[in-house]
């Protein structure tokens, strides 16, 4: 069994300043663990690059309610 | 880190209404999905409703559809659960849930949980 006290934290320092397109978008994570020292969400885009973003910004909020619709429609 | 508390819940004849209510403290409330589920005696939790952070957006159970409609007041921090034509069958303990990560009727996607709240419907 993995040693889940010993396991790494990831953290977002600072948040993109640039609003991403949906369309660039493959999916979401939340950071909210008290060890991180900002609530955050973790973009991959889908290239797989990772970007750190403010949740209490607004085209954060309708991203992840965007990634969150795609997760109920079934791919064909 | 987000603590939810759920109000409302009671004794009601079939065929009647309740409303209940979730106060959320803690982080941005906005920031969230927010979710209903609920749990009878012996059954696995399941999924009630669910309404998008903007609040634009909802999803029902195929069992509540009509029925019960979910809102939210961001100002307030608070989502509601407008329960009518109450049938035996919603009998139950309601949960209010916060979103923790990608998904919208999955109970491993929301990780804060209220305590719930008892909802009887008597025939």
């Known amino acids: 069994q993995p040693d889940a006290i010993n396991a790494p934290v990831t953290c977002c320092y600072n948040f993109t300043n640039r609003k991403i397109s949906v369309q660039r978008l493959a999916s979401y994570r939340r950071i909210t663990s008290s060890k991180c020292p900002k609530e955050a969400v973790i973009f991959k885009t889908i290239v797989a690059k990772e970007i750190c973003a403010d949740p209490k910004q607004k085209w954060v909020q309708d991203s992840m309610d965007h990634l969150d619709k795609q997760t109920q429609t079934p791919k064909t | 880190e987000v603590q939810l508390v759920e109000s409302g819940g009671g004794l009601v004849q079939a065929g009647g209404s309740l409303r209940l209510s979730c106060a959320a403290s803690?982080?941005?409330?906005?920031?969230?999905?927010m979710g209903w589920f609920r749990q009878a005696p012996g059954k696995e939790r399941e999924f009630v409703a669910s309404?998008?952070?903007?609040?634009?957006?909802?999803y029902y159970a195929d069992s509540v559809k009509g029925r019960f409609t979910i809102s939210r007041d961001n100002a307030k921090n608070t989502v509601y659960l407008q329960m009518n034509s109450l049938k035996s069958e919603d009998t139950a303990v309601y949960y209010c849930?916060?979103?923790?990560?990608?998904?919208?009727?999955?109970?491993?996607?929301?990780?804060?949980w209220g305590q719930g709240t008892q909802v009887t419907v008597s025939s």
């Open positions: 309404i998008s952070r903007s609040g634009e957006n909802t």
């Open positions: 849930a916060a979103s923790g990560g990608m998904g919208i009727s999955a109970p491993n996607s929301y990780a804060y």
């Open positions: 803690g982080r941005s409330f906005s920031s969230h999905r």
